[in-house]
């Protein structure tokens, strides 16, 4: 008979299955212990209350145990990300138990029905964990639930229902529709495990957000702002004009969370770091590259346990493919203007020269506008490790290369028609590396020539470690 559960009545009543297959579905959730990296190896199905398969399949009671929980499916077959994740976990944690939670019968439904089935699947996982806890040496502390999309909320339910506290839950782009703004007991939340870390890769403030936008863990990481992922634009996924749809873009961005996690498992030597910040815009301005007071963390599997009183939103930039790591730099440029130039929107580029390599020409993204006679902060990032920075080339783009730039030039000219000699003065650039936290100051190569105008460039050489110059008073506002 169905198990009654709490105030909401019988769990079995929550199963939303097409009538045609109602009789077929028993059990609705299977636990497949993946005993090999080889996806063709069928693994072992664990059965609640039956200890023999645990012994036959070599379940290691003292080792870490990963439960991988898939999400909604339109195909009824496991997508390749799951195979990649299983393989990566086996590579990284050779003795670990890797269990795939197969809830395809309940996930291969209308999305709304699959959502309504998440609770019962979470309960099934909790029951399996409760049973395993009865065994000697098995500890919930060693359990790590990894849920993708709808599976992240299933993991939340499992963590909520289990007797005791699961060691860790990782939410890989937890599903947004029907969960955004939901009560904490009806979605993944920080109290579902001792440590809940979340990667958000497909959040949208307009249109349908496939991934949840709100923070739902102890740490919530938003790679590339949590929305547009590099390598997932229409141009990137089309491959050829004959192929590709918006669906592919959605899949690419949503699934990126899984690949970032896989990357953290297999590219241990190239960890990606995220930085705490109140919002994406502040991060884009380069304001948030601090590691003080736990303000930065590795992402994915290597994330350090942080149990904050409130959610910690963290940001980073990534490459378009594995390894995803980039090197973040905060650049503080004090812009002097000796002429009243009105509103000006220069297009600046920098090239960084280091002991290991030189960067490409990198745009300085102006999030709002350049403040004159003030310090402007920018974020730049490189795909390669440049080593110690030696010099910086700053270029003000000259001839307009886009209609937008042409419009900016025209607007600037119309506002200041009698001021053709547009010119800014920059004496030095302060740089902070996000990855090393090292601060450097770069001074204009020619102290007599610190002016820059469209189509011109300035060179800066490292003139000291740290930021404070001689004869300089301490800044009144400390950046985080």
């Amino acid at each position: 008979s169905p198990t009654p559960f709490g105030p909401e009545g019988q769990l079995e009543d929550e199963l939303h299955k097409p009538k045609a297959i109602q009789t077929e579905v028993k059990p609705s959730v299977r636990f497949n212990l993946r005993t090999s990296k080889d996806p063709e190896h069928e693994g072992c199905y664990l059965s609640l209350g039956h200890s023999q398969p645990l012994e036959d399949c070599g379940f290691n009671m003292t080792a870490k145990t990963f439960f991988i929980i898939h999400g909604w499916t339109m195909s009824g077959i496991f997508e390749n990300w799951l195979h990649k994740l299983v393989s990566a976990l086996h590579t990284r944690e050779k003795d670990a138990n890797v269990v795939v939670v197969d809830w395809l019968p309940l996930a291969h439904q209308l999305y709304t029905d699959a959502v309504n089935n998440t609770r019962v699947v979470g309960h099934s996982i909790a029951r399996m964990l409760d049973w395993l806890q009865e065994k000697d040496d098995f500890s919930l502390e060693n359990v790590h639930l990894i849920g993708y999309s709808l599976g992240a909320h299933v993991a939340g339910y499992a963590g909520n229902f289990v007797k005791g506290t699961v060691g860790r839950i990782t939410g890989l782009d937890p599903a947004g529709p029907m969960f955004e703004g939901a009560d904490i007991h009806k979605r993944l939340s920080p109290d579902d495990a001792d440590f809940v870390d979340v990667l958000h890769t497909y959040t949208r403030s307009f249109g349908l957000s496939i991934g949840i936008q709100m923070p739902v863990g102890h740490i919530d990481i938003y790679p590339n702002g949590g929305d547009f992922q590099p390598g997932c634009g229409l141009n990137d996924v089309l491959g050829s004009m004959a192929y590709g749809t918006i669906t592919e873009v959605v899949k690419c961005e949503h699934e990126r969370a899984v690949h970032l996690f896989v990357d953290s498992l297999v590219n241990q030597d190239k960890p990606s770091f995220a930085f705490q910040c109140t919002d994406s815009n502040r991060f884009k301005k380069g304001i948030c590259l601090s590691c003080r007071k736990n303000r930065c963390n590795s992402i994915g599997y290597n994330a350090k346990k942080m149990r904050n009183k409130r959610n910690s939103k963290m940001y980073l930039k990534t490459r378009a493919g594995m390894p995803f790591r980039v090197y973040h730099y905060q650049m503080k440029i004090h812009v002097f203007s000796y002429k009243n130039m009105g509103e000006i929107e220069p297009t600046f580029y920098v090239t960084l020269y280091g002991t290991n390599a030189d960067s490409q020409t990198l745009p300085l993204e102006i999030v709002e506008r350049i403040e004159q006679n003030a310090t402007n902060t920018f974020l730049v990032y490189t795909e390669e490790d440049l080593g110690d920075l030696l010099k910086i080339q700053l270029t003000w783009e000259g001839a307009s290369q886009s209609w937008y730039n042409l419009w900016k030039e025209l607007r600037s000219y119309l506002s200041q028609p009698h001021n053709p000699g547009r010119e800014l003065n920059i004496r030095r650039i302060r740089v902070k590396s996000g990855e090393t936290q090292r601060k450097l100051t770069f001074c204009a190569e020619d102290p007599e020539n610190t002016s820059i105008s469209p189509g011109r460039e300035l060179w800066f050489r490292k003139c000291r470690d740290g930021w404070r110059m001689k004869n300089e008073t301490s800044p009144t506002v400390e950046l985080p």
């Epitope: 077959i77 496991f78 395809l104």
Partner: antibody
Framework: EVQLQQSGPELLKPGASVKISCKAS????????IHWVKQSHGKSLEWIGH????????NNNEKFKDKATLTVDKSSSTAYMELRSLTSEDSAIYYC?????????????WGQGTTLTVSS | DIQMTQTTSSLSASLGDRVTISCRAS??????LNWYQQKPDGTVKLLIS???KLHSGVPSRFSGSGSGTDYSLTISNLEREDFATYFC?????????FGSGTNLEIK
Amino acid sequence: EVQLQQSGPELLKPGASVKISCKASGYTFTDNTIHWVKQSHGKSLEWIGHINPYYGGTNNNEKFKDKATLTVDKSSSTAYMELRSLTSEDSAIYYCARKGIYYSSPFDYWGQGTTLTVSS
Amino acid sequence: DIQMTQTTSSLSASLGDRVTISCRASQDINNYLNWYQQKPDGTVKLLISYTSKLHSGVPSRFSGSGSGTDYSLTISNLEREDFATYFCQQGNTLPFTFGSGTNLEIK
């Protein structure tokens, strides 16, 4: 030994329907998926769709959505494909094939094929 | 849908020869490429999965390689039973698609 045994050849008139069977043996039927593939005369192979015998969930190639219906009978470890509103375009060899649980899993064992001829 | 192209529809070779059959995908398929052999009687067998993994029971003279969009199947020392038609198939994205086949004939 894994085996997929398909039903015999069929000769049918346009507009008719046919149900081809594929009996699996030598493995646990619910641990893999069954896929159907069409090969028109002297042509390449076309994936029609698959069924997950564990719960009966199916997914068809858009091209065959209105043509093929896939079912299973777990008690006899048999998969079926029904083709409706037959036309001469449906004349082909139809194969069932076993596949693992991932997209990327290959079709590791194939039935011997069922020849369907549609002619008035 | 991902298009799989086998440019050589027919290939003639002699016993003992080494032959290479190629297959190109219309986009990156992340090494999720499988090769099949179809005998004249219609029997289909899996030879290679995941670009280069030999299926159990398949002779070691068969090998596969490639990445991204370009893949190939090599038969190093042709034997009589190898004369057949060879198909590639991608397992990266639904719907699964096959190449048009390469018929290997005795010279």
